[in-house]
Amino acid sequence: PSPPPEKKELRKVAHLTGKSNSRSMPLEWEDTYGIVLLSGVKYKKGGLVINETGLYFVYSKVYFRGQSCNNLPLSHKVYMRNSKYPQDLVMMEGKMMSYCTTGQMWARSSYLGAVFNLTSADHLYVNVSELSLVNFEESQTFFGLYKL
């Protein structure tokens, strides 16, 4: 008799895109429509929830733009929450100062990506300093990870 078919394990991967109705931090993400992937990872209230310990590549890109540059400091962070830790742990952070000419139209992207050892029940989020300056187009602002 033929051996039973191998049970294929779901690849743990997520790619979420910008959601323009984000009103507060952490950023909220589109998890259903468009170029979205969500497999073996849960999405809950702005966060990606890990359900298996291991090494993961985590990434996020945020596209900032404005019309009359005031050079407000911009920050883009990916951070983690876990019931074991009393406070948020910043995993990656990008900062921009003096990035445009006063009064001019401008646009800047911030990309963060690195490998982390994540534990089951870790929650990952993205924070920005100036929500009003984020362009939420799905190709411009996104958040994701995949298990190595």
Epitope: Q67, N70, T102, S132
Partner: antibody
Framework: EVQLQQSGAELVRPGVSVKISCKGS????????IHWVKQSHAKSLEWIGV????????SYNQKFKGKATMTVDKSSSTAYMELARLTSEDSAIYYC????????????WGQGTSVTVSS | DIVMTQSPASLAVSLGQRATISCKAS??????????MNWYQQKPGQPPKLLIY???NLESGIPARFSGSGSGTDFTLNIHPVEEEDAATYYC?????????FGGGTKLEIK
Amino acid sequence: EVQLQQSGAELVRPGVSVKISCKGSGYTFTDYTIHWVKQSHAKSLEWIGVISTYQGDASYNQKFKGKATMTVDKSSSTAYMELARLTSEDSAIYYCARFPDWDYAMDYWGQGTSVTVSS
Amino acid sequence: DIVMTQSPASLAVSLGQRATISCKASQSVDYDGDSYMNWYQQKPGQPPKLLIYAASNLESGIPARFSGSGSGTDFTLNIHPVEEEDAATYYCQQSRELPYTFGGGTKLEIK
């Protein structure tokens, strides 16, 4: 309520300088750039320049370089514009207006400051 | 600099009728899918008041009888039906690039 309160009318002699002010209230002053606009009978509305309320650096219309100097005092939420070496051509109403970086236009304007240059 | 040419310089419109004001830019004021054209209303002794931004978007609190249209270099402000309180001077302005520039203004009189 958002307000931009400008200083009062000025009657000045030719050749002197004048400094006018624009105090913002009812919003976070450092979130918006401040633009200055000149209105005269001869030239309608002319954009003078813009200042970053956060950093204090400015961009000027080439035509007003050397004529106008913009500054900002974050502690008092006030923007200033000094006009130098005044001539009768500078007689006009000067407006300040705020511009949200995430928007398209100057959404709130001061009431205007009338500057009259006369000997 | 982008030159903004407004027409007509003045017009008189009967109460309840349509007022149409045109503005032509010397080069396109479009960028990345948006038109950086704004319209302001100014009454004597008052500062300009924002009516329309990004060519066709009505500023909060402005009556729906005001509308804007156009893209590239040609833009239009329509007021319909015109009311007594609309007597004012109207200016177009581009915010596509510095220095920002304004049209010469159109004075609207209500007959």
